[in-house]
């Protein structure tokens, strides 16, 4: 997208109820105008669960989302809900680009491989577009887990990416289960990792102007018999209205006696993670599996402060397992929406 262009979704007609999620890359400084529903009965716009005011630099007004000049902090998930109902009219993520090509880890490949982009700007050597997604360098992953390494990059011409393992070209042909190379997502995915997957994984990003590289160090930890198993999908993402009661459920299976904790993720000094790489958490509930209803976390009379990420952590003599869910708390008068499920993560 050229910096002078305006990002628009037109016309302003009520879309189908089967609204697909969209991702749009927006150049810094670019104006944005997105429409949702008919002007007279336009929907309400929300950013990350908070309703946008009708005035200000970023505003939701008569069914329109308007951003005068796109800034990095404007990136994120935007939702438009029909007035007086829970119908999702628009569900999209705005991604920060720049005056050159840009890419997001999971964006539509067309958005940064458009040939019309290729000659619009001077040539540029590859550069990392999302270095914050590459901060975790030393990975220690239990055997059987899935590992995803990402090296989102851009440049002109659009660079290519290839992967090395311990300095050698890596295509996964000798790996049971193979690998998934998603070049348009700049990612390498390995499922059910085993000790032979240990090593240094290098992403090499190149174009005619130059090249950059980044190393991920992977260790695979063997654990037998097994740590607790948590039922998939639990706890579930939940949306509640202020003042209501919420129950989060966690189903734990374990041979060895498990110990269960409910945690709420918190922010300290503006950071969600401590120096050790683990998230800051507050312990809400702790007990053994035999305790009554330890697998349920009750939140009474929820307020906006209760919104956030909750984790069920189960441990036994072998190790730890955990799964997380998001609680979204909306004002009483506003319709509800359910946040996207967080990425599955492994314990470092």
């Amino acid at each position: 997208l050229e910096a002078s262009e305006e990002v628009e979704l037109e016309p302003c007609l009520a879309p189908s109820l089967e609204q697909q999620e969209q991702e749009l890359t927006v150049a810094l400084g670019q104006p944005v105008r997105l429409c949702c529903g008919r002007a007279e009965r336009g929907g309400h716009w929300y950013k990350e669960g908070s309703r946008l005011a009708p005035a200000g630099r970023v505003r939701g007004w008569r069914g329109r989302l308007e951003i005068a000049s796109f800034l990095p902090e404007d990136a994120g998930r935007y939702l438009c809900l029909a007035r007086g109902s829970m119908i999702v009219l628009q569900n999209l993520t705005l991604i920060t680009g720049d005056s050159l090509t840009s890419s997001n880890d999971d964006e539509d490949p067309k958005s940064h491989r458009d040939p019309s982009n290729r000659h619009s700007y001077p040539q540029q050597a590859p550069y990392w577009t999302h270095p914050q997604r590459m901060e975790k360098k030393l990975h220690a992953v239990p055997a059987g887990n899935t590992v995803k390494f990402r090296c989102p990059a851009a440049g002109n011409p659009t660079p290519t990416i290839r992967w090395l393992k311990d300095g050698q070209a890596f295509h996964g042909e000798n790996r049971i289960g193979g690998i998934r190379l998603r070049h348009q997502h700049w990612s390498l995915v390995m499922e059910s990792v085993v000790p032979s997957d240990r090593g240094t994984y290098t992403c090499l990003v190149e174009n005619a102007v130059g090249s950059i590289r980044y190393n991920y160090l992977l260790d695979v930890l063997e654990r037998s018999p097994h740590r607790p198993i948590l039922q998939a999908g639990l706890p579930a993402n939940t949306t509640a209205v202020v003042g209501s009661d919420v129950e989060l459920l966690c189903k734990v299976y374990s041979d060895a006696q498990p110990h269960i904790q409910w945690l709420k993720h918190i922010v300290i000094n503006g950071s969600s993670f401590g120096a050790d790489g683990f998230p800051y958490v507050q312990v809400l509930k702790t007990a053994d599996i035999n305790s009554s209803e330890v697998e349920v976390l009750y939140l009474r009379n929820v307020s906006a402060e209760d919104a956030g990420e909750y984790t069920c952590l189960a441990g036994n003599s072998i190790g730890l397992s955990y799964q997380s869910a998001w609680l979204t708390v909306l004002p009483e008068e506003d319709p509800t929406w359910t946040a996207a499920a967080p990425e599955a993560r492994y314990t470092d």
Epitope: W128, P131, M134, E135, K136, K137, L138, H139, A140, P195, R198, G199, T200, T202, I212, R213, Y214, N215, L217, L218, D219, V220, L221, E222, F273, A275, D276, G277, D348
Partner: antibody, heavy 118, light 112 residues
């Protein structure tokens, strides 16, 4: 208490060998990458070697490659550095350090002095 | 010769703000996060800043870090006499034969 305690330093002649140990306590040793860092008298910090939690992967500075070997015994919560063919320039205080997923050393031992001299 | 370049010394008076720079290349600071360590005389190093600008718990907010391109800096505001120490920047280096963990040569901070 979370701590690292080095031992094994001392005086050794050029060409000789020495084995350093680092006893860890208070954290899950087996899932942490560990490193050795040294500091020559009056000089700055220099990375020597790192090892993955399982011990399956090791990494070395060019200055010690082929002479030093890093290893660990997770059942004893102990990190080792076997130093062979020692040179005068290997004289330093050797620290062991616990690494985080972000590649930073959050925990350091108090250090052990290795002197290589004839 | 250290891979990362720091000024050998810096100084300031109590209450002042002091900045220490750290210069590297695309293979280290340009691609990896920067950490800062404080080493008080006769003691082991201590982590001061990680992930470019994050402080571990217990580190006063007088210490702050930043990174831009292939350079990083550590700022100390409201300088105190107990801040007199050696300060080291560090980052992983992903050059051809890497990975390596590299340090700056250290900056000796004197509180006048």
């Amino acid at each position: 208490e979370v701590q690292l305690l080095e031992s094994g330093g001392g005086l050794v002649q050029p060409g000789g060998s020495l084995r350093l140990s680092c006893a860890a306590s208070g954290f899950t040793f087996s899932s942490n990458y560990m490193s050795w860092v040294r500091q020559a008298p009056g000089k700055g910090l220099e990375w020597v070697s790192s090892i993955s939690g399982s011990g399956g992967r090791t990494y070395y500075a060019d200055s010690v490659k082929g002479r030093f070997t890093i290893s660990r015994d997770n059942s004893k919560n102990t990190l080792y550095l076997q130093m062979n063919s020692l040179r005068a320039e290997d004289t330093a205080v050797y620290y062991c350090a616990r690494m985080t997923v972000f590649g930073a050393a959050t925990l350091w031992g108090q250090g052990t002095l290795v002197t290589v001299s004839s | 010769q250290s891979v990362l370049t720091q000024p050998p010394s810096a100084s300031g008076t109590p209450g002042q703000r002091v900045t220490i720079s750290c210069s590297g290349s695309s293979s280290n600071i340009g691609s990896n996060t920067v950490n800062w360590y404080q080493q008080l005389p006769g003691t082991a190093p201590k982590l001061l800043i990680y992930r470019n600008n994050q402080r571990p718990s217990g580190v006063p907010d007088r210490f702050s870090g930043s990174k831009s391109g292939t350079s990083a800096s550590l700022a100390i505001s409201g300088l105190r006499s107990e801040d007199e120490a050696d300060y080291y920047c560090a980052a992983w280096d992903d050059s051809l034969n890497g990975p390596y963990w590299v340090f700056g040569g250290g900056t000796k901070l004197t509180v006048l």
